[in-house]
Interface confidence: medium
């Protein structure tokens, strides 16, 4: 019996659903009674699902898992993995037996995008050419490890003087710190790359120093001139300090964070105390940072909703304020690709293939090319519908003429997360099984 | 198009300087970094350094530090090259060459047609 | 520096054969980039970031490699592939070219 699985890993965010996919052909008269499915881990042999005695099992894999059961008569043998953990990645074998029997393993690799770096400085106040500075470049709750890599304002790498480091939490998602240790000059800027290898993911910033006395009088609040990138559902921290002077207390700072548009308060610090979220619950300060004159903001569950500017104001004597921008983004998923009409195909048709992609955000980017990777932009019409969650489904219809046969791609990109999904089809113009 | 295009062959004496543009087309000169790298008649490619036009800042290979000098017409959308103190071994063809978009890309996506310079007394 | 040395400096191949050449770093490089050069004209971005392939290049070229070993290959030469190649690397400065492999007709 031939089972056939993807040859290529499948990879799956961590908290979205994967289908490992897996099928076989079922002969005439076949009936799922005479069906034994077996999804097992390859290495283990730790049951996952099964299927027998014409019934499903059930899920044996911490009831994350489900078949197809509408197409096991049809050969269609995939398991759904559910809420994707980085424990989940490994290999996972396929068991069908009929008559014959047959298995084949399909690989599951797990990825997780690494947030906007933040870039902290030590000493951050009073620098002049020549002192050593520490620059430390840190990017949250990505997988897997993550590369990382410095340059300076003319594009030059820098490879001396950096230690990284990449701390797994209980999830199994990496935090990277990466630490540069530079001479200043007169002024220079310094760049930070961390790199998923696996989504080919780049998240980059910069910070530009410029030694010189800051002038006495404002407070001066310092935020990230770039906006902070929030995947759907994960949380943000919107950076923001000030520079506390020798004796400082808490009980002299005033601290609030709003909405820049609306001014509606967000989260506030006041009398030597914090008083809370005044935004839905789901925001928090670090108080243990405060006196060092951390005044960020952490904001949970990130909603499309949430997406704008944020103002963090700080009173101590003097005041001092500075916003800084949320951007909301969620990937798209790979494209799922379908004909209209789907058989019977003759060079000479019209055919419409539809692109379609799921619960993305913001609005996506799409293009189509030809086999030769010529772009197709006439006939193509895209519509996308934010559903109540505000992300938003894509779907785009091309309309063409066959030839004697041809390749169709569909991508869907990201502008945000420049994360592309792409799917394409082949028609050959002969009747199609 | 983007386009490359430099300045016509030079002949110099040994301890003359020489100065070769590189004038870029069909793309915004500013965001993007460009370098210079040398090719002696029959041998390898070498890099001799490169300039950000947005704010003029450079990087020399050390090989050529106090020699070369590179500089910016963003006005005109041109990048230059000046080698001073000539010898005979700088006979090469001098490219100029664009470092790749991305603030990360470490290679040349887009290059110059060459300026051949001859050093001969 | 990081040298970096190409095999084999050249090589005698027949229209659609399969090509392979090897670039061995001095010392790790995060990166390798392959450029093909034809007599009298510029360098030409081959493959960028080690297994990248270059806008309008043909998908008969692929690279591979990791650390200090990074390999190019034509899958099927063609007569218009007959040309130097060229690896580089800026992993560290500076910026670094392999002496080149020539590939000519047999």
């Known amino acids: 019996l031939e089972v056939q699985v993807p040859e290529d890993p499948v990879v799956a965010l961590v908290g979205t659903d994967a289908t490992l996919c897996c099928s076989f052909s079922p002969e005439p008269g076949f009936s799922l009674a005479q069906l034994n499915l077996i999804w097992q881990l390859t290495d283990t042999k730790q049951l996952v699902h099964s299927f027998a005695e014409g019934q499903d099992q059930g899920s044996a894999y911490a009831n994350r898992t489900a078949l197809f059961p509408d197409l096991l008569a049809q050969g269609n043998a995939s398991l759904r993995l559910q809420r994707v953990r980085v424990a989940d990645e490994g290999s996972f074998t396929c068991f069908v037996s009929i008559r014959d029997f047959g298995s084949a393993a399909v690989s599951l690799q797990v990825a997780a995008p690494y947030s906007k770096p933040s870039m902290t400085l030590e000493p951050n106040k009073d620098l002049r050419p020549g002192d050593t500075v520490t620059i430390t470049c840190s990017s949250y709750q990505g997988y897997p490890e993550a590369e990382v890599f410095w340059q300076d304002g003319q594009g030059v790498p820098l490879t001396g003087n950096v230690t990284t480091s990449q701390m797994a939490n209980e999830q199994g998602l990496f935090d990277v710190h990466s630490i540069l240790r530079v001479v200043l000059g007169a002024n220079g800027t310094y760049s930070c790359l961390v790199r998923n290898p696996v989504l080919q993911q780049d998240a980059h910033s910069s910070v530009t120093i410029t030694p010189q006395r800051s002038p006495t009088g404002a407070v001066e609040v310092q935020v990230p001139e770039d906006p902070v990138v929030a995947l759907v559902g994960t949380d943000a921290t919107l950076r923001c300090s000030f520079s506390p002077e020798p004796g400082f207390s808490l009980a002299q700072l005033n601290l609030i964070w709003q909405l820049t548009d609306t001014k509606q308060l967000v989260h506030s610090f006041t009398e030597g105390r914090d008083q809370g979220s005044a935004y839905a619950n789901r925001t928090a300060l670090f108080p243990d940072l405060l006196a060092q004159g951390n005044a960020s903001l952490r904001l949970q569950r990130v909603r499309v909703a949430d997406e704008g500017s944020f103002t963090c104001f700080v009173s101590i004597r003097d005041f001092g304020s500075a916003a800084v921008s949320l951007q909301v983004a969620a990937p798209y998923s790979k494209p799922s690709m379908t004909l209209e009409p789907n058989k019977d195909l003759r060079p000479g048709d019209t055919v419409t293939i539809t692109c379609s992609s799921y619960r993305g955000y913001p609005e996506a980017e799409v293009f189509w090319q030809d086999g030769q990777g010529v772009p197709l932009t006439g006939n193509v019409t895209t519509s996308q519908m934010a559903n109540e969650q505000g992300l938003f489904d894509v779907h785009s219809v091309l309309r063409v003429v066959l030839g004697a046969n041809g390749t169709y791609s569909c991508l869907v990109r990201n502008p945000v997360l420049q994360q592309d999904a792409h799917g394409s089809v082949t028609i050959t113009g002969q009747p199609m099984t | 198009e983007v386009q490359l295009v430099q300045s016509g062959a030079e002949v110099k004496k040994p301890g003359a300087s020489v100065k070769v543009s590189c004038k870029a087309s069909g793309y915004t000169f500013t965001e993007y970094i460009m370098h210079w790298v040398r090719q002696a008649p029959g041998q390898g490619l070498e890099w001799m350094g490169g300039i950000n036009p947005n704010q003029g800042g450079t990087t020399y290979n050390q090989k050529f530090k106090g020699r070369v000098t590179m500089t910016r017409d963003t006005s005109i959308s041109t990048a230059y090259m000046e080698l001073s103190r000539l010898r005979s071994e700088d006979t090469a063809v001098y490219y100029c060459?664009?470092?790749?978009?991305?603030?990360?890309?470490?290679?040349?996506?887009?290059w110059g047609q060459g300026t051949t310079v001859t050093v001969s007394s | 520096d990081i040298q970096l040395t190409q095999s084999p400096s050249s090589l005698s191949a027949s229209v659609g054969d399969r090509v392979t050449m090897t670039c061995s770093a001095s010392s790790s490089v995060s990166y390798m980039h392959w450029y093909q050069q034809k007599p009298g004209k510029a360098p030409k971005l081959l493959i960028y970031d080690t297994s990248k392939l270059a806008s309008g290049v043909p998908s008969r070229f692929s690279g591979s490699g990791s650390g200090t070993d990074f390999t190019l290959t034509i899958s099927s030469l063609q007569p218009e592939d007959f040309a130097t190649y060229y690896c580089?690397?800026?992993?560290?400065?500076?910026?670094?070219f392999g002496g080149g492999t020539k590939v000519e007709i047999k």
């Open positions: 580089q690397q800026w992993s560290a400065s500076p910026l670094t």
């Open positions: 060459a664009r470092k790749g978009k991305d603030y990360f890309d470490w290679y040349f996506d887009v």
